[in-house]
């Protein structure tokens, strides 16, 4: 009986099992019982990542600088190009098809995790005892100044956006 299923790295066509083309190649013609599957290497700028029977390889991804993209890893005949974003930008999706500017943390918030090429800035509210008075993509919450260590006293309490104001201790007259 003709086969109804084939081994791994084979495919069924015309009642027979043909070898798939290996990664980095594309199908030219199916096998016959007299000749093996005919495959050819992918052209420059193309790739195939899996064992396949595709008649065309896939185009390498283009990292468009107009979208803030640059090449992180050059594609091969078996792998796609990997794009990342220019400094100060991050990918809008896992596929990294476009970039957006890193978010800045507003006053009252500090940077918990600095942005990378693939993830945005993560901000956190400054807890009691800490403040941030700038909008920044890098600055963490800073601790309030310790007036005591300077032999000073708190003249104005700090907030999540402002530092404490220290002043001299009142002298006993």
């Amino acid at each position: 009986e003709p086969p109804t299923a084939c081994r791994e790295k084979q495919y069924l066509i015309n009642s027979q099992c043909c070898s798939l083309c290996q990664p980095g190649q594309k199908l030219v013609s199916d096998c016959t019982e007299f000749t093996e599957t005919e495959c050819l290497p992918c052209d420059s700028g193309e790739f195939s990542a899996q064992w396949n029977r595709e008649i065309r390889c896939h185009q390498h991804k283009y990292c468009d600088p107009n979208l803030g993209l640059r090449v992180q890893q050059k594609g091969t005949s078996e792998t796609d190009t990997i794009c990342t974003c220019e400094e100060g930008w991050h990918c809008t999706s896992e596929a990294c098809e476009s970039c957006v500017l890193h978010r800045s943390c507003s006053p009252g918030f500090g940077v918990k995790q600095i942005a990378t090429g693939v993830s945005d800035t993560i901000c956190e509210p400054c807890p009691v005892g800490f403040f941030s008075n700038v909008s920044s993509a890098f600055e963490k919450c800073h601790p309030w100044t310790s007036c005591e260590t300077k032999d000073l006293v708190v003249q104005q309490a700090g907030t999540n956006k402002t530092d404490v104001v220290c002043g001299p201790q009142d002298r006993l007259r």
Epitope: N14, S15, Q16, T32, E33, F34, T35, E36, E38
Partner: antibody, heavy 117, light 107 residues
Framework: EVQLLESGGGLVQPGGSLRLSCAAS????????MSWVRQAPGKGLEWVSG????????YYADSVKGRFTISRDNSKNTLYLQMNSLRAEDTAVYYC??????????WGQGTLVTVSS | DIQMTQSPSSLSASVGDRVTITCRAS??????LNWYQQKPGKAPKLLIY???SLQSGVPSRFSGSGSGTDFTLTISSLQPEDFATYYC?????????FGQGTKLEIK
């Protein structure tokens, strides 16, 4: 025991026709691809034609395409090669062979075809 | 069609010799190559398939190697019955094609 026995060869004039037969025994004929290979006197081997198993496709060398036709009768366990418009350069011993995994593992003893006026 | 070129076309050797026959394809055929032996007045016999696999019943002194475009058939220690003509045959592209043959003669 696998056996392949060719017949039908002989002397024929240029432009003439001939039909070769290959009687198979000792194996399940319908399950195997079969082919014809020829060898001109004192020369090397030339693959002429092949036919797939299970009523599979037919394939030909460019030198015989359009002139030769391969066929099989699984009920008679017989392979055929119909040769038309024969030329002097078709003179050769014609072998039928059984195919397995892209190799010809059993061959007949051959039948001589002579094309001459 | 893929051209198969064997070398040498003929060679003389003695019993016990180690002999190597080469076959070159005009384009890459991966490991899709067979070797046959033919004695005068007889049909060819399959020796090696898929470049390096020994056909059942063939003595282990025969071996094959190579891939891409360059292949070799080696007989490790020639026996009297090994004097014959050897052919390579590719099955990487349609139609299958043979080399022109290498005639192995007694020195």
């Amino acid at each position: 025991e696998v056996q392949l026995l060719e017949s039908g060869g002989g002397l024929v004039q240029p432009g003439g026709s001939l039909r070769l037969s290959c009687a198979a025994s000792g194996f399940t004929f319908s399950s195997y691809a079969m082919s014809w290979v020829r060898q001109a006197p004192g020369k090397g081997l030339e693959w002429v034609s092949g036919i797939g198993s299970y009523g599979g496709g037919t394939y030909y060398a460019d030198s015989v395409k359009g002139r030769f036709t391969i066929s099989r009768d699984n009920s008679k366990n017989t392979l055929y090669l119909q040769m038309n418009s024969l030329r002097a350069e078709d003179t050769a011993v014609y072998y039928c062979a059984r195919y397995v995994n892209f190799g010809m593992d059993y061959w007949g003893q051959g039948t001589l075809v002579t094309v001459s006026s | 069609d893929i051209q198969m070129t064997q070398s040498p076309s003929s060679l003389s050797a003695s019993v016990g010799d180690r002999v190597t026959i080469t076959c070159r394809a005009s384009q890459s055929i991966s490991s899709y190559l067979n070797w046959y032996q033919q004695k005068p007045g007889k049909a060819p016999k399959l020796l090696i398939y898929a470049a390096s696999s020994l056909q059942s019943g063939v003595p282990s002194r025969f071996s094959g190697s190579g891939s891409g475009t360059d292949f070799t058939l080696t007989i490790s220690s020639l026996q009297p019955e090994d004097f014959a003509t050897y052919y390579c045959q590719q099955y990487g592209r349609n139609p299958p094609t043979f080399g022109q043959g290498t005639k192995l003669e007694i020195k």
